[in-house]
């Protein structure tokens, strides 16, 4: 690496992946192993994030970018940059302090994460229920009863619940 020549700040020419080494007369030195600098002009390199335990490595650390973690199977990410991993539940359940609990009647969860939500109120939009809701599925709304042709049945039984359903994101 060549010594920087900037008169104002000799460190400003140090590219990402290096740091301005005060101990070596402000020469641009490469980041040591397990550290990175994502922008130029850094006076130190940041320590790479380590994906341990319930976290697993999604992207390895490089000299210019931090490692990225996601969660091991059975868990999903929470928080910015996957700062936490939370246990998955099955569809039709939500995670409580006491573990995974089935959704109450009138609510559903079609994912392995998140909360049980109330079935959609079709009448809010002047529609009727076309397909009944279940613990795993929301209702499907359809035309208002007035829009249906005479003799047509308005409600379809729910489709049978199947895994994997909505995949955790």
């Amino acid at each position: 690496f060549e010594r920087t020549r900037s008169l104002q700040d000799p460190c400003s020419n140090c590219p990402a992946g290096t740091f301005c080494d005060n101990n070596r007369n402000q020469i641009c030195s490469p980041c040591p192993p397990n550290s990175f600098s994502s922008a130029g002009g850094q006076r130190t390199c940041d320590i790479c994030r380590q994906c341990k335990g319930v976290f697993r490595t999604r992207k390895e650390c490089s000299s210019t970018s931090n490692a990225e973690c996601d969660c091991t199977p059975g868990f999903h990410c929470l928080g910015a940059g996957c700062s936490m991993c939370e246990q998955d539940c099955k569809q039709g359940q939500e995670l409580t302090k006491k573990g995974c609990k089935d959704c109450c009647f009138g609510t559903f969860n079609d994912q392995k994460r998140g909360i049980c939500r109330p079935w959609t109120n079709c009448s809010l939009d002047g529609k009727s229920v076309l397909v009944n809701g279940t613990k795993e599925r929301d209702v499907v709304c359809g035309p208002s009863p007035a829009d249906l042709s005479p003799g047509a049945s308005s409600v379809t039984p729910p489709a049978p619940a199947r895994e994997p359903g909505h995949s955790p994101q």
Partner: antibody, heavy 119, light 107 residues
């Protein structure tokens, strides 16, 4: 009537960010999912993610997880999608859509916002 | 992710023709299949939801059928205003995915 009105076209430089807005009217904003869909020039449709404005619960397509941030402002009935670290491949029309009554289909579409990324 | 394979990618037909588009899902999606019309001005419109349910205000010449992995969209008698690109979309499993589209032209 139910309407989604999106912000105007944007031209951005690579590396920049852009925040596209989608103002909803004619219905209870907090009771329906808002989806975001991308259409690159001459390409098909790609679902980026969605938000339930009542509690701001979001889902993302893994492909957009590091690219898009979806938010909603209940006070103005407006949903947003912010795109970061823009690259030329992000050049596309971005649509917001509202569900039909349950999340499984999209009944109302905004007019689309063209985002062009060019140096 | 669930792949949606739509065919044909384009087709040319005459006014009054019966037009059929198919969509195949890479896994069972029950009946959570929707069809959209996108006109050249880029506005998109939901025509059919939950495989076969016609949205209010949509002409009855449009219909849909199928279940599981194989789905069909039909225009019984093509009209000039039907010139558009048609997309299928599965709403069964996140992330929602679309077919690549069928561009319909008048002969």
């Amino acid at each position: 009537q139910v309407q989604l009105v999106q912000s105007g076209a944007e031209v951005k430089k690579p590396g920049a960010s852009v925040k596209v807005s989608c103002k909803a009217s004619g219905y209870t904003f907090t009771s329906y999912w808002i989806n975001w869909v991308r259409q690159a020039p001459g390409q098909g449709l790609e679902w980026a993610g969605n938000i339930y404005p009542s509690d701001s619960y979001t889902n993302y397509n893994q492909k957009f997880k590091d690219k898009a941030t979806i938010t909603a402002d209940k006070s103005t009935s407006t949903a947003y999608m912010e795109l970061s670290s823009l690259r030329s491949e992000d050049t596309a029309v971005y649509y917001c859509t509202r569900d039909y009554g349950s999340a499984y289909s999209m009944s109302t579409w905004g007019q689309g916002t063209t985002v062009t990324v060019s140096s | 992710d669930i792949q949606m394979t739509q065919s044909p990618s384009s087709l040319s037909a005459s006014v009054g023709d019966r037009v059929t588009i198919t969509c195949q899902a890479s896994q069972d999606i029950s009946n959570y299949l929707n069809w959209y019309q996108q006109k050249p001005d880029k506005t998109a419109k939901l025509l059919i939801y939950y495989t076969s349910r016609l949205r209010s205000g949509v002409p009855s010449r449009f219909s849909g059928s199928g279940s599981g992995t194989d789905f069909t969209f039909t225009i019984s008698s093509l009209q000039p205003e039907d010139i558009a690109t048609y997309f299928c979309q599965q709403g069964d499993t996140l992330p929602y995915t679309f077919g690549q589209g069928t561009k319909l032209e008048i002969k």
